[in-house]
């Protein structure tokens, strides 16, 4: 079931080897998974209680985004 040996050394460590294009690294199961079907609502700051507007995000935009960005709620992938 696993998609190969690409993995992070630790949950908070930088990735030594990024996933291939169109894949993302899933921290829960520690391996690369397909980055398809990304329809992501934008995050709200911690403590905010109002619903956030939804946006559409293409997989290639997600995969290519910088790892320092704010977290985006992500519907699919697992």
């Amino acid at each position: 079931m696993r998609r190969g040996p690409r993995s992070l050394r630790g949950r908070d460590a930088p990735a030594p080897t990024p996933c291939v294009p169109a894949e993302c690294f899933d921290l829960l199961v520690r391996h690369c998974v397909a980055c398809g079907l990304l329809r992501t609502p934008r995050p709200k700051p911690a403590g905010a209680s109002s619903p956030a507007p939804r946006t559409a995000l293409q997989p290639q935009e997600s995969v290519g985004a910088g790892a320092g960005e704010a977290a985006l709620p992500l519907p699919g992938l697992l």
Partner: antibody, heavy 126, light 107 residues
Framework: EVQLVQSGGGVVQPGRSLRLSCAAS????????MHWVRQAPGKCLEWVAV????????YYGDSVKGRFTISRDNSKNTLYLQMNSLRDEDTAVYYC???????????????????WGQGTTVTVSS | EIVLTQSPSSLSASVGDRVTITCRAS??????LNWYQQKPGKAPKLLIY???SLQSGVPSRFSGSGSGTDFTLTISSLQPEDFATYYC?????????FGCGTKVEIK
Amino acid sequence: EVQLVQSGGGVVQPGRSLRLSCAASGEWFSSYGMHWVRQAPGKCLEWVAVIWYDGSNKYYGDSVKGRFTISRDNSKNTLYLQMNSLRDEDTAVYYCARRFTHLRGWIIEDYGMDVWGQGTTVTVSS
Amino acid sequence: EIVLTQSPSSLSASVGDRVTITCRASQSISSYLNWYQQKPGKAPKLLIYAASSLQSGVPSRFSGSGSGTDFTLTISSLQPEDFATYYCQQSYSTPLTFGCGTKVEIK
């Protein structure tokens, strides 16, 4: 409205099988991972299994591994839990739930379960 | 398997009280800790994710804090609808695990 409607519970004898269903309200279903979680009477919540949005990968809790199978039919917007070789200790309310994740760059972070079904009761008894 | 220990297992409080519930993990889980509310006969409801982020639609009197192994859920001013059981859950690694709950009862 985002909704999960469960069915398939009932009373079953030890060693027998049962299949639970969880029907999603809309087209969102095919882009979400899904979980099964259970709660025995007066007990803690226990995670049972998870399935990828496309059904390509599945993980199970140790207590059900080899006996239960999680699956999905995205064309029917439905999640399933096939339960075989049922034991007394499988008696519980079973919930389906939607996986809630965030994407940070190309890293997926898991943030629990944000939509739950109403629950269905499974009683294993002779 | 990561074990989550909640305390207290139950507490009695009055409307308007400030209530604090703690959850301790058997190993560091960074901020991958979520809180749920469950009322009798109902499914759990996600309140707080990532230790401190308020889920959409949840009143701001609920807040979460902590990282590593020690986490806290706080209800700043308890309301009648808040009497329920609260669970923590880690999403750091599989198997996903839950605490055994804190029941908040009316004093």
